[in-house]
């Protein structure tokens, strides 16, 4: 059997189909999930939908063999098999491995460490999302692209704020979180607040009390 891989986002509508023509004048066509769980069977000009978690969410096009599934969820992850009984009585099968992924949530950036080291500012940030298998990329004024959840960098003395963006992504979606750091490095933790993304129209910043007061008056 030929195997095709498909990755889709949860909640979407999916079409499972094969890239080739169906055998001519086939007798029967059946879609299964896993090896032997029938979803729908076309036989003698009629489609029979089986009692399964898909009932009411699927539709078969007997012309092309395509199976339409609405509102897929992660629980629909499976290998789907289309078996066609040809007029000679032999079957032919095609397999589609469907992976359904949730869109990644917006990451939260945490300050793991912040300290003075020889007049420079050592900064360790982590990009946190709840239990997902994702890719991480950090953007900003960095010597090289960093592709894990933790960013460690040393800043030379500077006057302006520095911003770092963490992008989390899977094969169906990506989200960013941005952290802006205002000098000095030794600013007391109590003088700083973490402002939510919504408050700042899309950015997450660590900002001083003074700036915070100013921000709320505009």
């Amino acid at each position: 059997g030929r195997l095709v891989h498909m990755t889709v986002v949860s909640g979407s509508n999916v079409t499972l189909n094969i890239s080739e023509s169906l055998p001519e004048n086939y007798k029967q066509l059946t879609w299964f999930y896993t090896f032997d769980q029938k979803i729908v069977e076309w036989d003698s000009g009629k489609s029979k939908y089986f009692e399964s978690k898909f009932k009411g969410r699927v539709r078969l096009d007997p012309q092309s063999g395509a199976l339409y599934i609405s509102k897929v969820q992660k629980e629909d992850n499976s290998t789907y098999v289309m078996r066609v009984l040809k007029k000679d009585g032999y079957e032919q099968e095609w397999k589609i491995k469907l992976q359904v992924l949730d869109p990644v949530p917006k990451p939260v950036i945490k300050i793991e460490k912040r300290e003075d080291v020889d007049d420079n500012c050592y900064l360790k940030l982590s990009c946190v999302i709840p239990g997902e298998s994702v890719n991480y990329t950090w953007y900003g004024e960095l010597p090289k692209e960093i592709q894990n959840s933790v960013l460690e960098t040393t800043l030379k003395p500077h006057k302006h704020s520095r911003c770092y963006t963490c992008q989390v992504s899977n094969s169906v979606s990506s989200k960013n979180g941005t952290f802006c750091f205002s000098p000095p490095c030794t600013a007391a933790r109590s003088e700083q607040k973490l402002i939510s993304e919504e408050d700042l129209g899309g950015e997450q910043k660590l900002i001083s009390e003074e700036d915070l007061h100013h921000h709320h008056h505009h």
Epitope: G1, T30, F32, T34, F35, D36, Q37, K38, F50, E51, S52, T79, V81, R83, G89, Y90, E91, Q92, E93, K95
Partner: antibody, heavy 118, light 108 residues
């Protein structure tokens, strides 16, 4: 009415291997999904492995996954079960059966006994 | 997976009597996809009933199946000497396919 005849059973050491065969006659073999079902001495029935008519997809019980492999040669009308890393708990009579319409098992062969012991 | 529990474990009856065997599923068996098999000592199982109540080819009409959802019954209306055997139920409503542990029908 088709007939199925198993062979290849016998005594094997723990960790050893055996290959079972099931020869089909009186049926157009390639039209049917096939299965192996086993029965430990004095116990009930447990399906082991399944294979589609074309041989394009297979399915194994968790208890044998990674150790047993089902295959078929439609030109020889024969079903196989390659059993590796055998354990004492694999001791059973192994039956091949047609997996009728991917639903029930009918007909069955007469079975072949596999004993795993040191 | 669906667990099938058969009762009683052993049924002691005389020829000519009626036998009632039960198969209970841990969850509903979709579309009543349940089969019954008979197995005699030293022999392979033989299909008796499929789809809960349809008799397989060449099965005598003294064998009948009924039930739905989680409760299924195999009835042998009048036991013949050749009916003393072990009977298994099997569901094919969900994967993996599972069998009951069997009911032995023995001569009283």
């Amino acid at each position: 009415e088709g007939q199925l005849l198993e062979s290849g059973g016998g005594l094997a050491q723990p960790g050893g291997s055996l290959r079972l065969s099931c020869a089909a006659s009186g049926i157009t073999f390639g039209r049917y999904a096939m299965s192996w079902v086993r029965q430990a001495p004095g116990k009930g029935l447990e399906w082991v492995s399944l294979i589609s008519g074309s041989g394009g997809s297979t399915y194994h019980a968790d208890s044998v996954k990674g150790r047993f492999t089902i295959s078929r040669d439609n030109s020889k009308n024969t079903l196989y079960l390659q059993m590796n890393s055998l354990r004492a708990e694999d001791t059973a009579v192994y039956y091949c059966a047609i997996y009728n319409n991917y639903n029930w098992f009918d007909p069955w062969g007469q079975g072949t006994l596999v004993t795993v012991s040191s | 997976e669906i667990v099938l529990t058969q009762s009683p474990g052993t049924l002691s009856l005389s020829p000519g009597e009626r036998a009632t065997l039960s198969c209970r599923a841990s969850q509903s068996v979709s579309s009543n996809y349940l089969a019954w098999y008979q197995q005699k000592p030293g022999q392979a199982p033989r299909l008796l009933i499929y789809d809960a109540s349809s008799r397989a080819t060449d099965i005598p009409d003294r064998f009948s199946g009924s039930g739905s959802g989680t409760d299924f019954t195999l009835t042998i209306s009048r036991l013949e000497p050749e009916d003393f055997a072990v009977y298994y139920c099997q569901q094919y409503g969900s994967s993996p396919r599972t069998f009951g542990q069997g009911t032995k029908v023995e001569i009283k």
